[in-house]
């Protein structure tokens, strides 16, 4: 039988917020330092 | 069927980093989170963290936050732990597991023992 | 962080004989999909842990049907109905409905 793809994993839906609220935050902490760089530049 | 094998024991010096690798086959890497959990010397269980090796979406215990490093290597199937600022407490056996659809534990390595002493 | 609290903390048993380990929550481990992702790994001496309910009272694919899970909330008890010499070891409930994920300390069973 053909494997699941991962969102099929039960761990994927017990960790969905949280690793999506984390990837918000890299996403900012990203376009934070990307703001800095241009103030420097 | 599945299968995890894991890198060999370690002997560390406080203060020191360790990396322990976990091999994974018979089922497709990407298709399952990975996740390590330690037991010290005659102690429980404790979830150290998880990784999606597809997108390397990673979440860590608080506890570890800061000192353990979660990766894969795709391309061999493998996941790997690294932890820092090792101290004799983390001497303890390391284990990587999967799950399935619906349950978080379901298959095992074969652990790494990693003593950390002076 | 939820606490698994689990007794006996060591289980003397008879060969032939039924055993109950029972594991205490320290709140509702149902989860908000209305699931309760309790479950209980079995480690014999020097083996990794091995999985053998998920969801309360599923047993998981390979396991003995002596072995059976019970409970709801923040009571759960792992039975197995007639302990033989390979169900010796340590018995681990766990949580995966709140994070961190946690395990309770371990139940020892040994030979009485």
């Known amino acids: 039988s053909e494997e699941p793809p991962i969102s099929l994993d039960l761990t994927f839906h017990l960790l969905r917020e949280v690793l999506e609220m984390a990837r918000a935050e890299q996403l900012a902490q990203q376009a934070h330092s990307n703001r800095k760089l241009m103030e420097i530049i | 069927q599945v299968q995890l094998v894991q890198s060999g024991a370690e002997v560390k010096k406080p203060g020191a980093s360790v990396k322990v690798s976990c091999k994974a086959s018979g089922y497709t890497f990407t298709d399952y989170f990975m996740k390590w959990v330690r037991q010290a010397p005659g102690q429980g269980l404790e979830w150290m963290g998880v990784?999606?090796?597809?997108?390397?979406?990673?979440f860590y215990n608080q506890k570890f936050k800061g000192r353990v490093t979660m990766t894969v290597d795709k391309s061999i199937s493998t996941a790997y732990m690294e932890l820092s600022r090792l101290r004799s407490d983390d001497t303890a056996v390391y284990y990587c597991a999967r799950g399935t659809d619906r349950a978080l534990f379901a298959y095992w390595g074969q652990g790494t023992l990693v003593t950390v002493s002076s | 962080d939820v606490v698994m609290t689990q007794s006996p903390l060591s289980l003397p048993v008879t060969l032939g004989q039924p055993a109950s380990i029972s594991c205490r929550s320290g709140?509702?481990?149902?989860?908000?999909?209305?699931?309760?992702?309790l479950e209980w790994y079995q480690q014999r001496p020097g083996q990794s842990p091995r999985l053998l309910i998920y969801k309360v009272s599923n047993r998981f694919s390979g396991v003995p049907d002596r072995f059976s899970g019970s409970g709801s909330g923040t009571d759960f008890t792992l039975k197995i109905s007639r302990v033989e010499a390979e169900d010796l070891g340590v018995y681990y409930c766990f949580q995966g409905s709140h994070i961190p994920w946690t395990f309770g300390g371990g139940t020892k069973v040994e030979i009485k």
């Open positions: 990784i999606n090796p597809n997108q390397g979406d990673i």
């Open positions: 709140q509702s481990i149902v989860h908000s999909d209305a699931n309760t992702y």
